[in-house]
Amino acid sequence: EEELQVIQPDKSVLVAAGETATLRCTATSLIPVGPIQWFRGAGPGRELIYNQKEGHFPRVTTVSDLTKRNNMDFSIRISNITPADAGTYYCVKFRKGSPDDVEFKSGAGTELSVRAKPSAPVVSGPAARATPQHTVSFTCESHGFSPRDITLKWFKNGNELSDFQTNVDPVGESVSYSIHSTAKVVLTREDVHSQVICEVAHVTLQGDPLRGTANLSETIRVPPTLEVTQQPVRAENQVNVTCQVRKFYPQRLQLTWLENGNVSRTETASTVTENKDGTYNWMSWLLVNVSAHRDDVKLTCQVEHDGQPAVSKSHDLKVSAHPKEQGSNTAAENTGSNERNIY
């Protein structure tokens, strides 16, 4: 009679993570008598997957009943496959021995490849805000996918970006992989409503890529432009001076009026108007009683935006051009400014 051969008909098997893998194995003879064992890998580091004779293998079931006398089918099923299960599996026949069974013949091996989906890409931007014309970096990370081949693209408002660097780790063989990409984006004043998108395509996603997004509103700081103007005289001795704070983002803004360098009033931007591009406008006004001044008045609108160093704009008020009211010592009325907006 011909010597027993162990047949593993499938050179490779591809299974999606979470599914059950079937590893086929048959023997060509019932002799010699002895159990079958399944291993992953070869050499001294090989791992025991199933032992017909003894042991507890909760994820492994046999395809046929191995207790039947004439059984020659030693195929197994491994449930709930993960990327960690990838490798070459060997079906090995042992010959009954005393005191221990002896390895008799091995199958050629079946390579189990596991397809695992990448995790949802996570996009993160810089820790601190940056102003237009500056270049900022965004990172995108996705983990746990297999096989290694993967495509990553970056977009800003639907336009593909080209300035990025991507690494897939580890470089060598692994049960699963991670991708890490860094893209450089130049900010513009119109980017408050902009989005940066990282798109990951993988064989497991059936052409429906995963996307991670970051809103540039979390990253950008658009500094305000200031304009101080003098409005027509309200009453004989009162002048209305307005400070228009335009096109700023985010909203966090504090404004201080100074008269000849002395603080007159401080207020926080509250009722702002929003521009189409997502930036804000605000106006503050100061009613100056010119009759209280003998000399010209230097009015300064000082704005501290989003914790940045203050910027200011000044306006010289010519007192000589106005009649002076005797006995008045009030220089400015601290009238609220948020009731009126020019936009």
Epitope: G43, P44, G45, R46, L48, G97, P99, D100
Partner: antibody, heavy 122, light 107 residues
Framework: EVQFQQSGTVLARPGTSVKMSCKAS????????MHWVKQGPGQGLQWIGA????????TYNQKFKGKAELTVVTSTSTAYMEVSSLTNEDSAVYYC???????????????WGQGTLVTVSA | DIQMTQSPSSLSASLGERVSLTCRAS??????LNWLQQEPDGTIKRLIY???SLDSGVPKRFSGSRSGSDYSLTISGLESEDFVDYYC?????????FGGGTKLEIN
Amino acid sequence: EVQFQQSGTVLARPGTSVKMSCKASGSTFTSYWMHWVKQGPGQGLQWIGAIYPVNNDTTYNQKFKGKAELTVVTSTSTAYMEVSSLTNEDSAVYYCTRSFYYSLDAAWFVYWGQGTLVTVSA
Amino acid sequence: DIQMTQSPSSLSASLGERVSLTCRASQDIGSRLNWLQQEPDGTIKRLIYATSSLDSGVPKRFSGSRSGSDYSLTISGLESEDFVDYYCLQYASSPFTFGGGTKLEIN
């Protein structure tokens, strides 16, 4: 009780070969991989390779391929290692140890031979 | 190949003292790490297998642990026979590799 008895000290000339032995007793020889480890004078340990007595399957550390050759005689439960083209660098103590026929944590390198000292000198 | 970086290479300590030796793995080896003891006459004995399992007959003052890629052997209450050489060994991936060794000397 499991024991490994290694052959005695060897003094050899450069360019020649030496063959040392490791006789196992106290368990089933064919259920284990036999490993060899080198320790140079005042140095650490280096894994050379291993052999599986059932089918003479061998695995080597790339650094020792062509330098060491592993064999077994199953009938006498003895593992052999031949080190060829000897140089001063081969002067060392060589140990045999074992691991189970698959990767069983408790069975990795439990038992060790006493070592064979090889001195290479002209 | 997986590199096992063992530290310190030598250590002076006193009887009764508690000491820790560390091995850092350059790649993931899971729990597949042994600690070996080598006597001055060359005799090698395994103390710990699978990172933290104590071999039978090994005194309870020896213990093994892991933190990330760092593996430690701790001897609590040194005795005179402990002042020998110690090696870690990874058996996760071939070629199997050893740490450079630690020589434990009496103060």
